[in-house]
Interface confidence: low
């Protein structure tokens, strides 16, 4: 567990004076429809709500929306309405916010079923000022800002045409007609689909894959019999229908489509589907569903080309092609991901990984904790966390496991101690250690959210009756202060703090009725005043992750390095500040074993850390197609883990050699690739 | 539409073993508990035990422990239970039903569809 | 093995009226029990699981409550057809058992 000095929980002084002069309530002049929210920039303050009220009419549907700005954290909103001709705002399509602190935003408006085309509202003053556009085409999607080039805006039409701007959606030109999914690349290239015969549906599996590095002057047909594409880290998929029969397989790319690779992975069927589930420029963590309408499959781990695959994970939960997955990265510790399984008797259990997929075991059953009724020994069972598949499912979970980058080893979820995930009502956990350790921080569902880099955590109860007190931690969760934010409870509806967790503000937002009316509701609190002080050195200390057994020399290595880590202490009631950094510092390990997967043609004999052949493949020549060329592979069965920093110890020899040869995977060779421009 | 047919009524003589089978249609069989449970005259619903399709195992009430055998075979989506030494008071309307899921969740799984029932009569 | 003790076992009630029927384990259960509608002659149906939780497509004028050892069957407005026995059962621990049973006749 993390460093944490164990005391009674002493009250934070004065708290309610200090809150009370530090609460804003803002009541919103509408009536209760829906209510959507976004940041726009970085640390700016400047939030847009946007609330929508649908009248259904005998004929039509009458609706209104008003636009809201603040830019002090959401403790003073004005109404902006008239910026934008009162015009009302499709919510389907959200708050389009540009990348970084651009402080671009385009709203699509609702438009009458004659017209020509779709209309949109743009701002580039973080929405001080909007201009209205006529647009030459009906928008079937949200604008997609170019990550490079905030200027370069692209959409598909109802009919299906992939549109580009330059000039942040001022004028706008169709490039290319029987569009299916369109998607930017890196340095501004677009990548999309295109049907030949009669739809997108039609054509599944005959799709094209074009790429265009231009914004549609040229063109570049990169793919063929595509099925879907995907883009992850530095690697491009496409699933590829096979020649002879109705399955396909992944194909990947690591120069934006020149050349293909067939990844190592099973082929799948019809009613099969292929998801990228996380992805960095290292490696991807692939699901491959299983035939039938199992509800699972198996998550396998790339090589650092995407090509030669690990079984990572049997019978991983994940229901039907764009369904639920409970698959979590656990963004406050390097290398630690949670999911969960469907076990032989369809229970549903958790599982975490330390080591990037290397190993996966269930999670620790936190202390004074008792295991409930899905346990055969009610003395052995571990935590099982709720996530995205709970929340689907319609259970008691208001909220996904939560985790921060800058708040070093805290991961706060709801979960049940058992053999398996129940139905009964969750309490809320939270672990200080990036998943080994959990102790119960809150009794039932909560909302919550971290403050200050995780100086502060704050829950809400999720309860259907009104509300009017909020909870708040200054010590990660092992004792919690109440603060009644009003006297007249509201329907709470949700929490909303500035991402990235920087922020001390924290806005509560729900609704108030009253016999003829209902109105929505913000109550923003600042912090500031409980966090009294800057931080100073003597409120940090250093804390090892990864650390299960401090005697070992290599403790705390994972993927051939360990860092030593900042952190604040428990005790410490003071501000990390906006600008705080992380502050680490990493040593390399000696290389292992477990430092390397098996390479093509080689597997791990469960409880084994060696790699052996694959029978089937014993006495072959290890020959296989990379980027349309055959190569030959010498190898003792081993390969670095991607983003393994290990150095020295042991080192296994390995080395490919260029055939020469030509060779295609069911794809395209260099030589049918075609070019064309406009 | 999910639905389960069972097997119908049988007439046995004490000493001697009933099977009775539940054919399951509509949903994918591995993936839901199959229950047993009988109803003897004017009484109550009493449980006798379940079988997991997928795996094949199996919980057996103590009172059949012994007595009862709960099988499946996935090829024809089929469930059967049969009950060996039959006594008179083994005289029942014995139902097959599908253990609730609840999309995987151990849940107390409440029984959601029901087989039509089938009669067995033990006398000599 | 777990005993659940319905009550009362037997009622009559008209049209219209709201009906509870009440169901008692000998221990805990926490929020592990179901309830179930049967008519003569046919198979049980379930109506309410995991104590509250109103299974598909049965009538809204069900709803089941309780936790622990006491739990509630309510039907708030009584039709012609929920005339039939009620049973409670329990799934915390094997073996699953069932209530006597609740006869709501008609008055």
């Known amino acids: 567990s993390a460093p944490g000095e164990d005391e009674e929980c002493g009250r934070v002084r004065d708290f309610v004076a200090k809150l009370a002069n530090n609460t804003h309530q803002h009541v919103f002049d509408d009536l209760r429809g829906s209510v959507s929210l976004s940041w726009v920039g970085d640390s700016t303050g400047v939030i847009l709500v946007l609330t929508t009220f649908h009248v259904p009419l005998v004929i039509m549907t009458f609706g209104q929306s008003k636009l809201y700005r603040s830019e002090d954290y959401g403790k003073n909103f004005k109404d902006i309405t008239d910026l934008i001709n009162n015009t009302f705002i499709r919510t389907e399509f959200g708050m389009a916010i540009g990348p970084e602190n651009s402080g671009k935003v385009v709203l699509t408006a609702e438009v009458s079923g004659g017209s020509r085309g779709g209309r949109i509202f743009r701002s580039s003053d973080f929405a001080k000022n909007f201009v209205q556009t006529d647009l030459p085409f009906h928008p079937l999607t949200q604008m997609m800002y170019s990550p490079q080039n905030s200027d370069y805006l692209l959409a598909l039409s109802t009919e299906n045409g992939l549109w580009v701007s330059k000039n942040f959606g001022g004028k706008w030109e169709e490039i290319h007609k029987a569009v299916c999914l369109a998607k930017w690349g890196s340095d501004n290239t677009i990548f999309f689909t295109t049907y030949a015969n009669g739809s997108c549906k039609a054509d599944l599996g005959a799709l094209e894959l074009w790429r265009t590095s231009d914004l549609g002057k040229s063109f570049k047909t990169i793919g063929v019999k595509i099925y879907s594409f995907g883009l992850g880290g530095r690697f491009l998929f496409a699933s590829v229908m096979a020649d002879k029969d109705t399955t396909r397989r992944i194909h990947v790319s690591t120069d934006q489509g020149d050349t293909w690779s067939m990844a190592q992975l099973p082929s799948v069927g019809q009613e099969q589907f292929y998801s990228i589930l996380a992805a960095n420029d290292d490696m991807v963590f692939m699901h491959v569903d299983e035939p039938g309408d199992t509800g699972f499959g198996t998550i396998f781990t790339s090589d650092d080309r995407g090509i030669v695959y690990s079984k990572s994970l049997d019978r991983h939960l994940y229901t039907t092609t764009g369904g639920e997955t409970d698959f979590t990265n656990v963004t406050s510790l390097r290398g630690v991901y949670i999911t969960s399984v469907l076990s032989e008797d369809n229970s549903i259990q958790t599982m975490i990984t330390f080591d990037q997929g290397g190993r996966w075991t269930h999670l620790r059953k936190p202390e004074n904790s008792e295991c409930d009724a899905t346990a055969k020994n009610k003395n052995e069972c571990s935590l099982h966390i709720h996530a995205s598949y709970s929340i689907s499912q319609k259970l008691n979970v208001p909220m996904a496991p939560l985790s921060e980058p800058n708040a070093v080893g805290i991961v706060i979820a709801h979960g049940s101690v058992g053999d398996a995930i129940s139905v009964m009502v969750p309490d809320v956990y939270i672990s200080d250690d990036g998943g080994y350790s959990w102790t119960k921080m809150l009794e039932g569902p909560h909302y919550y959210t971290i403050l200050d880099s995780g100086g502060i955590i704050v829950a809400i109860e999720h309860s259907s009756r009104p509300i009017n007190v909020i909870k708040f931690s200054t010590d990660e969760g092992q004792c919690w202060q109440t603060y009644t934010f009003t006297r007249d409870p509201i329907y709470f509806t949700g929490l909303a703090s500035e991402p990235g967790a920087r922020s001390m503000n924290i806005s509560i937002w729900g609704f108030t009725e009253s016999f003829l009316t209902s109105q929505w509701v913000s109550y923003t609190i600042d912090f500031k005043d409980i966090l009294e002080r800057n931080c100073e050195e003597k409120d940090y200390t250093i804390w090892l992750a990864h650390s299960t057994d401090p005697e070992d020399y290599e403790d705390g290595c994972i993927l051939g390095y360990k860092e030593q880590f900042l952190r604040l202490r428990k005790s410490s009631v003071c501000q990390n500040g906006r600008d705080y950094v992380v502050t680490k510092q990493p040593s390399i390990c000696l290389c292992s074993l477990e430092d390397f997967l098996c390479d093509f043609g080689y597997y791990r004999p469960e409880n084994d850390s060696k790699c052996v052949e694959q029978p089937e493949l014993k006495g072959h020549d290890l020959e296989f197609c990379l980027y349309g060329r055959e190569e030959h592979l010498t190898t003792n069965g081993y390969r670095k883990i991607p983003g393994d920093k290990c150095q020295g110890g042991v080192n296994p020899v390995r080395e490919v050699k260029d055939l020469k040869k030509k060779c295609t995977s069911n794809f395209l060779s260099p030589e049918k690739q075609n070019s064309k421009s406009n | 539409q999910v639905q389960l047919v069972q097997s119908g009524a049988e007439v046995k003589k004490p000493g001697a073993s009933v099977k009775v089978s539940c054919k399951a249609s509509?949903?994918?069989?591995?993936?839901?508990?199959m229950h047993w449970v009988r109803q003897a005259p004017g009484q109550g619903l009493e449980w006798m035990g379940w079988v997991n399709p997928n795996s094949g195992g199996t919980r057996y009430a103590q009172k059949f422990q012994g007595r009862v055998t709960m099988t499946r075979d996935t090829s024809i989506s089929t469930a059967y239970m049969e009950l060996s030494r039959l006594r008179s008071d083994d005289t029942a309307v014995y139902y097959c039903?599908?253990?609730?899921?609840?999309?995987?969740?151990?849940?107390?799984?409440?029984?959601?569809?029901w087989g039509q029932g089938t009669t067995v009569t033990v006398s000599s | 093995d777990i005993q659940m003790t319905q009550s009362p076992s037997s009622l009559s009630a008209s049209v219209g009226d709201r009906v509870t029927i009440t169901c008692r384990a000998s221990?805990?259960?926490?929020?592990?029990l179901n309830w179930y509608q049967q008519k003569p002659g046919k198979a049980p149906k379930l109506l309410i699981y995991a104590a509250s939780s109103l299974q598909s497509g049965v009538p809204s004028r069900f709803s089941g409550s309780g936790s622990g050892t006491d739990f509630t069957l309510t039907i708030s407005s009584l039709q012609p057809e929920d005339f039939a026995t009620y049973y409670c059962?329990?799934?915390?621990?094997?073996?699953?058992?069932f209530g006597g049973g609740t006869k709501v006749e008609i008055k």
């Open positions: 509509g949903y994918t069989f591995g993936a839901y508990y």
């Open positions: 059962q329990q799934s915390d621990v094997s073996p699953i058992t």
């Open positions: 039903a599908r253990g609730k899921r609840s999309s995987g969740w151990y849940e107390g799984y409440g029984m959601d569809v």
């Open positions: 221990q805990s259960i926490s929020s592990y």
